[in-house]
């Protein structure tokens, strides 16, 4: 019986977790789009070589996105990216990592 084999519960748990991660990943993408490209008053995040730490209010959509990011990273990574001045890292669908929430002007 498929449920009787050793490790199958673990497999189910893993696939369930993966499904949840995929769902959250999609949610994060939606939030990204909602916050950026559709709004002239909002810039899309741009990865830059210099990060600046600034105090900004955490509310609304940012709070929601922070929760999604935390769930995506847990339990293997720390809650904050230490010393980066960013409130999180964005993991895209091919698993590369880019800065989120820490853009400043790129100087020439």
């Amino acid at each position: 019986h498929p449920l009787g084999s050793p490790g199958s519960a673990s497999d189910l748990e893993t696939s369930g977790l993966q499904e949840q991660r995929n769902h959250l990943q999609g949610k994060l993408s939606e939030l990204q789009v909602e916050q950026t490209s559709l709004e002239p008053l909002q810039d899309s995040p741009r990865p830059t070589g210099v990060w600046k730490s600034r105090e900004v209010a955490t509310e609304g959509i940012r709070g929601h996105r922070k929760m999604v990011l935390y769930t995506l990273r847990a339990p293997r990574s720390p809650k904050m990216v230490q010393g980066s001045g960013c409130f999180g890292r964005k993991m895209d669908r091919i698993s590369s990592s880019s800065g989120l929430g820490c853009k400043v002007l790129r100087r020439h």
Epitope: P40, R46, G101, K103, L105
Partner: antibody
Framework: QVRMQELGPSLVKPSQTLSLTCTVS????????VGWVRQAPGKALEWLGI???????GYNPALKTRLSITRDTSKNQVSLSLSSVTTEDTAVYYC??????????????????WGPGRMVTVSS | QAVLTQPSSVSRSPGQSVSITCSGS?????????VGWFQQVPGSAPKLLIY???SRASGVPDRFSGSRAGNTATLTITSLQAEDEADYYC???????????FGSGTRLTVL
Amino acid sequence: QVRMQELGPSLVKPSQTLSLTCTVSGFSVTNSGVGWVRQAPGKALEWLGIINNDGVAGYNPALKTRLSITRDTSKNQVSLSLSSVTTEDTAVYYCGTRDLPSDVRYGNMYINYWGPGRMVTVSS
Amino acid sequence: QAVLTQPSSVSRSPGQSVSITCSGSSSNVGYGNYVGWFQQVPGSAPKLLIYSATSRASGVPDRFSGSRAGNTATLTITSLQAEDEADYYCVSYDSSSKFGVFGSGTRLTVL
């Protein structure tokens, strides 16, 4: 260092098109949005429009039909075009950008780098 | 006519405090902490003081602070100095137009 300057004619005839260019140095217009604001003599500040770092433009609803904002990324410039001008369009025209974290919601409203402004008079 | 209402003028003596209000509606000021404040000395470009309702822009003294409650945003300046004499404008996101709106402006005179 971020520098911005509004360039264009200081005198425009009624019914003509007012065209200004915002020249930018110290940052790329693909990294930060550029906004336009004007101020008629003795009056309050007024939003004209904004083009974000993706090239998406937004306009003051009251001016939307007459206004166009475009950018030239190769020249790192943003241009404003206001058609069918009247004497009511006489004002100092400013362009500006912001240097704030990208997660600041509606951050392009918060301009903290400004050009010196260009006084444009509409008169025949 | 500006959508956001500010007192046209206020005056105070040096060392005193002043609060400048910016009244709007549920579609702008009341929509969230998407409010900013600019200072403008006549003849010069505006200067950003406050963004996101309460955050001070870089280099702005802590004598300047912002708050928002309901449909009203407030800029408070403590320990007034002569150089604070200027025009002050609020700005807010407006959800109905999906664009920004400025307040009518307040002339602050330091006596």
